[in-house]
């Protein structure tokens, strides 16, 4: 029962996760133009992985897609690419889990499939999450570096008299979402890691027992069904793992399809 | 059709606090930000202030203490109350509609305020 | 504040000729998150409300005739009236719509010679 209930809640906390995964990574607000110690314009400015957006004191707001693939910093690209390998490792990881759930029958299902299929799940959330806070962490640390380094423009080359307002730009909703889904999913993988071990049959120790037939001597020693745990060559196993990585291949052209919506 | 139109007294005492209502029609203030404007007699304009969809405001620093500008979104009313008028008040007070650009697209035909006793 | 100086204050040019009006702010209103100046043009005639003619230093309003260009970028900004009509003569205002507070240029008053 409290395998089941491990289970269960490893896989819904992983379904909220890349949920918020795909919230962050489609979300404008990765960074927001900072207002502190600022002039107060009339513009906000605020950009996401895919386009960057202006919204007017009026309330009128105005979003550009970044048009161009190769124009784009490289940090920018390493996050989608973060981003996007966790929502596919996460997505297949929902798929595969959902067929692992115990309170769920599927034909003859063994338990030890089951297993297998759980601790499959439970490393795709756990990478999935690392993917996330990676890519994450990433973007804020070029956030800060990018920040500091226009604080420091703001105060040098101001001899001439005309100012010109340097747009800093500070965390954004997105990061945070990003954070606290990464680490969901985390969770989630981890809870499912565990259910694995309480999913697969502990080897049966019996104690030998001899039966005398007349005339020979032969011991049965029942015992010894040892469950597959996940790491010896489950050919469903290996199907999961190669349709991860065709779908992992065939994802990469996304942000390029994306910025010429 | 676009309409604001302002009213309000045409004569205030010094001291006095101004009072004024911006009526609009063609538009909900839910949609759009209204702006108030003054123009001294033969002078320049001069921006005050402004109310924004969701209720927030922004004022010119330099009239900051004495400004404050409401609406009535049932009502489609934005008013604009000064505090402690004098002479240098005395002006054309303009309601307008912000549009792209924080642009003023639209402007009422204004209402003149005189401050004298 | 934004101070916003326009030259001339007073221009007089003949019908069908060129006018062209200068305003400059003291900050650059160009926003770098959409590379666009944040500067709008009004035409004020005597005994009415101004009128929206540019916005976002270039972009004409819709119903302004094509002879009004707004051009510039940063600080410095330019109105121009092709063929000056006799119903062109009025006050021209230039406004920061960028850094409040959302200040004025003093105005030009244009005439016919």
């Known amino acids: 029962m409290a395998v089941t209930a491990c289970q269960g809640l490893g896989f819904v906390v992983s379904l909220i996760g890349i949920a918020g995964i795909i919230a962050a990574t489609c979300m404008d607000q990765w960074s927001t133009q900072d207002l502190y110690n600022n002039p107060v314009t009339a513009v906000f400015n605020y950009q996401g992985l895919w386009r960057s957006c202006v919204r007017e004191s009026s309330g009128f707001t105005e979003c550009r897609g970044y048009f161009t693939l190769l124009g784009l910093p490289a940090m920018l690209q390493a996050v989608r690419a973060l981003m996007i390998v966790g929502i596919v490792l996460g997505a297949i990881g929902l798929l595969v889990s959902i067929f692992a759930l115990k309170c769920i029958r599927i034909g003859s299902m063994e338990d030890s499939a089951k297993a297998n299929m759980t601790l499959t799940s439970g490393i795709m959330f756990i990478v999935s999450g690392l993917c996330a806070i990676a890519g994450v962490s990433v973007f804020a640390n070029m956030l800060v570096t990018n920040f500091w380094m226009s604080t420091a423009n703001m105060y040098t080359g101001m001899g001439g008299m005309v100012q010109t307002v340097q747009t800093r730009y500070t965390f954004g909703a997105a990061l945070f979402v990003g954070w606290v889904a990464g680490g969901l999913t985390l969770i989630g993988g981890v809870m499912m890691c565990i259910a694995c071990r309480g999913l697969a049959p502990e080897e049966t120790n019996y104690k030998a027992v001899s039966y005398h037939a007349s005339g020979h001597s032969v011991a049965y020693k029942p015992g010894g069904f040892k469950a597959s745990t996940g790491f010896g060559s489950n050919t469903k196993n290996k199907k999961i793992y190669d349709g991860g990585a065709r779908t992992e291949d065939e994802v990469q052209s996304y942000p390029s399809k994306h910025d010429y919506v | 059709q676009v309409q604001l139109k302002e009213s309000g007294p045409g004569l205030v005492k010094p001291s006095e606090t101004l009072s004024l209502t911006c009526t609009v029609s063609?538009?909900?203030?839910?949609?759009?930000?209204i702006s108030w404007v003054r123009q001294p007699p033969g002078k320049g304009l001069e921006w005050l202030g402004e109310?924004?969809?969701?209720?927030?405001?922004n004022y010119n620093s330099a009239l900051k203490s004495r400004v404050s500008i409401s609406k009535d979104n049932s009502k489609s009313q934005v008013f604009l109350k000064l505090s402690s008028v004098q002479a240098a008040d005395t002006a054309r007070y303009y309601c307008?509609?912000?549009?792209?650009?924080?642009?003023?697209?639209?402007w009422g035909q204004g209402t003149l305020v005189t401050v004298s006793s | 504040d934004i101070v916003m100086t326009q030259s001339p204050d007073s221009l007089t040019v003949s019908l069908g000729e060129r006018a062209t009006i200068n305003c400059k702010s003291s900050?650059?209103?160009?926003?770098?998150?959409?590379?666009?100046?944040?500067l709008t043009w009004y035409q004020q005639k005597p005994g009415q409300p101004p009128k929206l003619l540019i916005y976002?230093?270039?972009t004409r309003e819709s119903g302004v005739p094509d002879r009004f260009t707004g051009s510039g970028s940063g600080t410095d900004f330019t109105l121009t009236i092709s063929s000056l009509q006799a119903e062109d003569v009025a006050v021209y205002y230039c406004?920061?719509?960028?850094?409040?507070?959302?200040?004025f240029g003093p105005g030009t008053k244009l005439e016919i010679k």
């Open positions: 307008g509609r912000l549009s792209y650009g924080n642009s003023l697209d639209y």
């Open positions: 109310i924004w969809t969701g209720g927030g405001t």
């Open positions: 063609g538009f909900s203030l839910t949609s759009y930000a």
């Open positions: 900050q650059s209103l160009l926003n770098s998150g959409n590379q666009k100046n944040y």
């Open positions: 406004q920061n719509n960028f850094i409040y507070p959302l200040t």
């Open positions: 976002w230093a270039s």
